[in-house]
Interface confidence: medium
């Protein structure tokens, strides 16, 4: 087992909303959970956009999830990951 | 399930800060959404916060932003909050309580500590 | 804010009957994720408060199969189908779909 590195950015959208996007790359084996959450509530699913999870040419994967969001609220929103047993919450930074 | 073992009563002078804290024990302090409820005597309950373990993320009642201020501490798997420029307003219990959103998919305040009770007298 | 009202303020029982307690949102508490996140507390006198119906219907784990919540949009109730002597206090439901997450003002539910 491989445990995926996740990284977390942030970048501009239309005006007073930021498109927050979680990426996990690095991983193995390729079954992962990767959601936003508000709250600690997962969002649904038309909320958000995902990327398909695709081999990075070393043997292990990677993926994304991306949602838009109010700028303000920023502080609500986590990226939850889940694989291989292991979970991690990540904030959206500063 | 867990204990949440909350600070004793406080008894503080006008315009002074407190600082409760929120000892947990028996669950994965660093996974948890922790909230603080506010209830003065004989009404209802007020959410004030949460705080994430994990990261310390917070987000706040905007009735409670200049008031309220929460933190956490992994190592001693405890949740504070710091109430601050107190009045006779903000006497009341105040309580801490875990929410429960992997066993239930969606529980607020599943688990709560005994509550505090905070008297702001002269 | 969301403002949660509950009827009545009072409600006298005696034991062994049903009892029917009513909340009413100011607006739909659907969260965007769809979920209904409408939930019922009871609290006894001198203790903090115990959940006993999360997401509108589902009984939190040790909660009797007396307690039954249902309802949707704005309208909730939760009912009591034999109310015992553990059971008096008072009941508050509670909405966590719109921050500010709040309360409603209590149904105190007692011997008559």
């Known amino acids: 087992t491989v445990p995926p590195m996740v990284n977390v950015t942030r970048s501009e959208a239309s005006e007073g909303n930021i498109t927050v996007t979680c990426r996990a790359s690095s991983f193995y084996p390729r079954n992962i959970i990767l959601t936003w959450r508000q709250d600690g509530v997962s969002l649904s699913h038309d909320t958000q956009q995902w990327g398909d999870v695709l081999p990075d040419g070393n043997g292990t994967y990677q993926t994304w999830v991306a949602t838009r969001i109010c700028r303000g609220e920023a502080q609500r929103f986590t990226c939850y990951m889940e694989h291989s047993g292991n979970h991690s919450t990540h904030p959206v930074p500063s | 399930q867990g204990q949440m073992q909350q600070s004793g009563a406080e008894l503080v002078k006008p315009g002074a800060s407190v600082k409760l804290s929120c000892k947990t024990s028996?669950?994965?302090?660093?996974?948890?959404?922790i909230s603080w409820l506010k209830q003065k005597p004989g009404q209802s309950l007020e959410w004030i916060a949460w705080?994430?373990?994990?990261?310390?993320?917070?987000s706040y009642n905007q009735k409670f932003t200049a008031k309220a201020q929460l933190t956490v501490d992994t190592s001693s798997s405890t949740a504070y909050m710091q109430f601050s420029s107190l009045t006779t307003e903000d006497s009341a219990i105040y309580y801490c309580?875990?929410?429960?959103?992997?066993?239930?998919?969606?529980?607020?305040?599943?688990?709560w500590g005994q509550g505090t009770l905070v008297t702001v007298s002269a | 804010d969301v403002l949660m009202t509950q009827t009545p303020l009072s409600l006298p029982v005696s034991l062994g009957d049903q009892a029917s307690l009513s909340c009413r949102s100011s607006?739909?508490?659907?969260?965007?994720?769809?979920?209904?996140?409408l939930e019922w507390y009871l609290q006894k006198p001198g203790q903090s408060p115990k959940l006993l119906i999360y997401?509108?219907?589902n009984r939190f784990s040790g909660v009797p199969d007396r307690f039954s919540g249902s309802g949707s949009g704005t309208d909730f109730t939760l009912k009591i189908s034999r109310v015992e002597a553990e059971d008096l206090g008072v009941y508050y439901c509670?909405?966590?779909?719109?921050?500010?997450?709040?309360f409603g003002g209590g149904t105190k539910v007692e011997i008559k």
């Open positions: 309580a875990r929410h429960d959103y992997y066993g239930t998919s969606g529980a607020w305040f599943a688990y």
């Open positions: 028996g669950f994965t302090f660093s996974d948890n959404y």
């Open positions: 705080i994430y373990a994990g990261t310390g993320g917070t």
């Open positions: 607006q739909n508490i659907v969260h965007i994720n769809g979920n209904t996140y």
């Open positions: 997401k509108v219907s």
């Open positions: 509670f909405q966590g779909s719109h921050v500010p997450w709040t």
